[in-house]
């Protein structure tokens, strides 16, 4: 998977009036890394691992960062038009990536009210706008802002496209991010499904990077994927992630199936318990 | 490539005991199963268990509960199967084979001829 | 046990035939089958699983079909190294089972 930075802003506004302040929260290779602390105005790190990152370094240049951007989209806020009575929001995500070839991507996506009406591929400088026509009329609207403002020239793009690549190979220097190596905990339960039939579930949490290999073997070999369920791998709010999987199988059969889990080049293989939850830390 | 290298020939008395090993080269060992399957001369083939190399889990074939014992040693990726109690009826070349993870038996060793004879 | 029955216990073939070899379980086993050639030296090969899934590295010629019960095994076009036992295996229940095998000879 690439290594990316995500940036994740949101102003508001209230019966046509722009508010102060805005929110903000920056991921680093999918996990939550910094936000923004409206309270102090300061870019905070999102857990430990985050402020080992940057080690004792501050985080000025973040805050920084943060703050200009969200004096941006609130002036783009206040140029959109059409804003009823209520409140509004204006959100800008902001993704650059790098990819194992060196090579870079980078987007930038507007949504109002939760809704996606406009979208940037900084590299192609291509512009795209969904087929509605309230996205139409709001992707036009700040489209002729951008225009007028000329900070928002190709340039100005390019830069935060630069400044966004920048930071990431920043933190990417760290050892922290590079050579993180979490294994996951494993745990297989089992619950009653219906008649002569048990749902084994397997669960990996706490682990990083991403990438994991988590499936039912009957007698040594994989289920096919029809028979089995997946939950999506998600962070888990420690810098870490967890995902599942899941399939029914008779009761008796139990001795017959293990999870098999991969990750980051290290392997092991989980037992059904015989009644129990049954937890097992992974040891390399 | 994946092999599966099994100890030579054994000529046993009745009553004794014997120990066939299967050495894996070509993969990582403790990824996949290693099964054992019994042919006496001449017959079919038979299921005799299997082990897990990763944390030592066996599953045997009831006829064959007693008769035959499962281990691995992870160090030099080699699994063995003890027969013990020997009769002419354990007379029969013993096969030991792995899996893809995709597939049963996938890889088979060259089996190892067992005689139990007075 | 499930028991496996290929009823034929040899077969006559001649170089560039369509062979047919059958296996009958004791009850459906879902797919749940594997075939498996060996050679007059005891080289044992895995050819098809789940019932019709050809092993990488395995010629074409040699295909799988059934359901429930009943399954075969077919050779398209007979080549001289085709010459073997070839046994079926269940592996929907335990203890997983072999067919008795059908020794393919040359006519």
């Known amino acids: 998977e690439p290594h990316s930075l995500r940036y994740n802003l949101t102003v508001l506004s209230w019966d046509g009036s722009v508010q102060s302040g805005f929110l903000a929260e920056v991921h680093l290779d999918g996990q939550p890394f910094l936000r923004y602390d409206r309270q102090k105005c300061r870019a905070k790190p999102q857990g430990q691992w985050a402020e080992d990152v940057l080690g004792n370094k501050t985080w000025d240049r973040e805050t920084r960062d943060l703050t200009g951007n969200g004096k941006d989209l609130r002036m783009t806020l206040a140029h959109i038009k059409d804003q009823k009575e209520g409140l509004h929001s204006l959100q800008e995500i902001r993704v650059c990536e790098i990819h194992e070839d060196n090579s870079t991507r980078s987007s930038q996506h507007f949504y109002y009210d939760g809704e996606l009406f406009l979208s940037q591929n900084v590299e192609t400088e291509e512009w795209t706008v969904p087929q509605s026509s309230r996205a139409q009329t709001l992707a036009m609207n700040v489209r002729n802002f951008l225009k007028e403002d000329a900070m928002k020239t190709k340039t100005h793009y390019h830069a935060m496209h630069a400044d966004c690549l920048q930071e990431l190979r920043r933190y990417l220097e760290s050892s922290v991010v590079l050579r993180r190596r979490v294994p996951p905990m494993v745990n297989v339960t089992r619950s009653e499904a219906s008649e002569g039939n048990i749902t084994v579930t397997c669960r990996a949490s706490s682990f990083y990077p991403r990438n994991i290999t988590l499936t039912w073997r009957q007698d040594g070999v994989s289920l096919s994927h029809d028979t089995q369920q997946w939950g999506d791998v998600l962070p888990d709010g420690n810098g870490t992630y967890q995902t599942w999987v899941a399939t029914r199988i008779c009761q008796g059969e139990e001795q017959r199936f293990t999870c098999y889990m991969e990750h980051s080049g290290n392997h092991s293989t989980h037992p059904v318990p015989s009644g129990k939850v049954l937890v097992l830390q992974s040891h390399w | 490539q994946v092999q599966l290298q099994q100890s030579g020939p054994e000529l046993v008395k009745p009553g004794a005991s014997v120990k066939v090993s299967c050495k894996a080269s070509?993969?990582?060992?403790?990824?996949?199963?290693i099964y054992w399957v019994k042919q006496s001369h001449g017959k079919s083939l038979e299921w005799i268990g299997y082990?897990?190399?990763?944390?030592?889990?066996?599953v045997y074939n009831q006829k064959f509960k007693g008769k035959a014992t499962l281990t691995v040693d992870k160090s030099s990726s080699t699994a063995y199967m003890h027969l013990n109690s020997l009769t002419s009826e354990d007379s029969a070349v013993y096969y030991c084979?792995?899996?893809?993870?995709?597939?049963?038996?996938?890889?088979w060793g060259q089996g190892t001829l067992v005689t139990v004879s007075a | 046990d499930i028991q496996m029955t290929q009823t034929t216990s040899s077969l006559s073939a001649s170089l560039g035939d369509r062979v047919t070899i059958t296996c009958s379980a004791g009850?459906?086993?879902?797919?749940?089958l594997n075939w498996y050639q060996q050679k007059p030296d005891g080289t044992v090969k895995l050819l098809i699983f789940?019932?019709?899934s050809l092993q990488s590295g395995v010629p074409s010629r040699f295909s799988g079909s059934g359901s429930g019960a009943d399954y075969s095994l077919t050779i398209s076009n007979l080549e001289p190294e085709d010459i073997a036992t070839y046994y079926c295996q269940q592996y929907s229940k335990l203890p997983l089972t072999f067919g008795a095998g059908t020794k393919l000879e040359l006519k």
């Open positions: 070509g993969y990582a060992f403790t990824k996949y199963n």
């Open positions: 084979a792995t899996t893809d993870g995709y597939s049963l038996f996938t890889y």
């Open positions: 082990i897990d190399p990763y944390n030592g889990g066996t």
């Open positions: 789940y019932t019709s």
């Open positions: 009850q459906g086993i879902n797919n749940y």
